[in-house]
């Protein structure tokens, strides 16, 4: 996160850190807890690393430097990448992770509410992006979870800024005209949340941007409301009940 500040314990209890353990262990992406056994993240996080065994998911943490070999983590039971996502394109950048074991909810580890299907009428004015990603383009992963308040921009405005790319209705953009505040490398897959009527909702999944926090280059996020049918379909349990935080 560029231009952000330190978060507090329990401020973003749905934020998780997706880490890979090969020879060393490192944070690669963020994610959002949406149910006892489900995390929502970006599909591009798994490019070149589709093996679920190498991933460790840390929830209920604030400081990455607090993680030791004894820190509990979740393992992946299943990675569900959107069927229309292609490595060679930038669309449908969304994936679900089913955890091997369900998580108990606590003050520091609980899910984010999802938006209603096709939510286009709600005007969100209080939106935040969080993550442990770089604090500048040529930066490094941060220890303490960062937060930054960023306004949404219209898709029309966003398209003007990214004429080389197609900004679809299944994307949402956020940023300041002057830049300075944005997500960055390592924040991918993490949440763009907005508070509306006293409730936080997961509006976007951190996907891409041209550099980080550059002037007139907003961040681009996967629009969660556009994928509610897909999320519901994939997270339905065998008894037909959705094991996730229902939309408000």
């Amino acid at each position: 996160i560029v231009g952000g500040t330190n978060s507090s314990w329990g401020e973003w209890p749905w934020q998780v850190s997706l880490q890979v353990k090969l020879t060393a262990q490192r944070h690669l992406c963020g994610g959002s807890l949406i149910g006892h056994q489900w995390v929502l993240t970006a599909a591009h996080c798994f490019d070149g690393l589709p093996l679920q065994d190498v991933w460790r998911i840390y929830s209920g943490i604030l400081n990455l430097s607090d993680i030791t070999k004894d820190t509990p983590f979740s393992q992946i039971k299943e990675i569900i990448i959107h069927q229309n996502y292609k490595v060679s394109e930038g669309n449908h950048d969304i994936a679900l992770i089913k955890l091997q074991a369900p998580l108990n909810y606590t003050e520091f580890q609980k899910p984010i509410c999802l938006p209603s299907k096709g939510d286009t009428s709600t005007i969100y004015t209080n939106c935040w992006v969080t993550g442990w990603g770089f604090s500048k383009e040529k930066g490094e992963i941060q220890n303490i979870l960062q937060k930054v308040n960023i306004p949404l921009v219209t898709n029309e405005e966003c398209q003007k800024r990214y004429q080389d790319y197609k900004i679809t209705q299944r994307m949402v953009c956020a940023g300041y005209k002057e830049g300075g505040k944005d997500a960055c490398k390592g924040d991918s897959g993490g949440p763009l949340v907005c508070k509306h009527n006293g409730m936080w909702r997961l509006v976007g999944i951190t996907s891409w941007g041209e550099g980080c926090a550059r002037r007139e280059q907003p961040g681009v996020y996967t629009k969660v409301a556009e994928y509610m049918d897909w999320i519901l379909e994939k997270t339905q349990s065998s008894d037909g009940k959705a094991q996730m935080q229902s939309p408000a």
């Epitope: 591009h44 060679s88 394109e89 004429q163 790319y165 960055c184 390592g186 924040d187 891409w208 041209e210």
Partner: antibody, heavy 125, light 108 residues
Amino acid sequence: EVQLLESGGGLVQPGGSLRLSCAASGFTFSVYMMIWVRQAPGKGLEWVSSISPSGGQTTYADSVKGRFTISRDNSKNTLYLQMNSLRAEDTAVYYCARVARGIAARSRTSYFDYWGQGTLVTVSS
Amino acid sequence: DIQMTQSPGTLSLSPGERATLSCRTSQFVNSNYLAWYQQTPGQAPRLLIYGASSRATGIPDRFSGTGYGTDFTLTISRLEPEDYGTYYCQQSSRTPWTFGQGTRVEIK
């Protein structure tokens, strides 16, 4: 299976014209930026021109600007390169390629993931 | 224009040896826009590495890419007979998109 097949090459005199075609199959052509790259005999690769998915934006190397025109017909899944005022130095194998533009580490990527087999253009009197 | 300079021009190595190919750019290049291609005689180029370090589909893990900014490296950990040919680095950071002049890897 992604396939790109160039055609239209041949021998042409200096000052002459030629139109290259590249037939694409196995993917959604209208989603991808496409390019032409050439390789003079015994030399390296040179990017020639690119065109946006819709065809609305085109870019050219200085060496061909004003002489070559890139275009596409998404209904026919075909890419074109119209070459006018040809010179001896335009002699090369011309390849069409697909531009992949995915996402990695919260940034867009750009690379040429599929190439045609090439068509030889010889400009000589 | 961004100039791409590859070294060495030619690399003579035996099968099983390690090959290290260098690519230097005249300006900063975002790693996500740096790719490597392999070309064997009479064939079209083939994508090996994109984003400076990501292997393309079907490329064996003996190929690896590293680098940042202006210095990039392609490494072939153990040369196989099919690896001989010419290797090009290429940037799509800004137009004109440019290629290096190539490094030829030949059998010693």
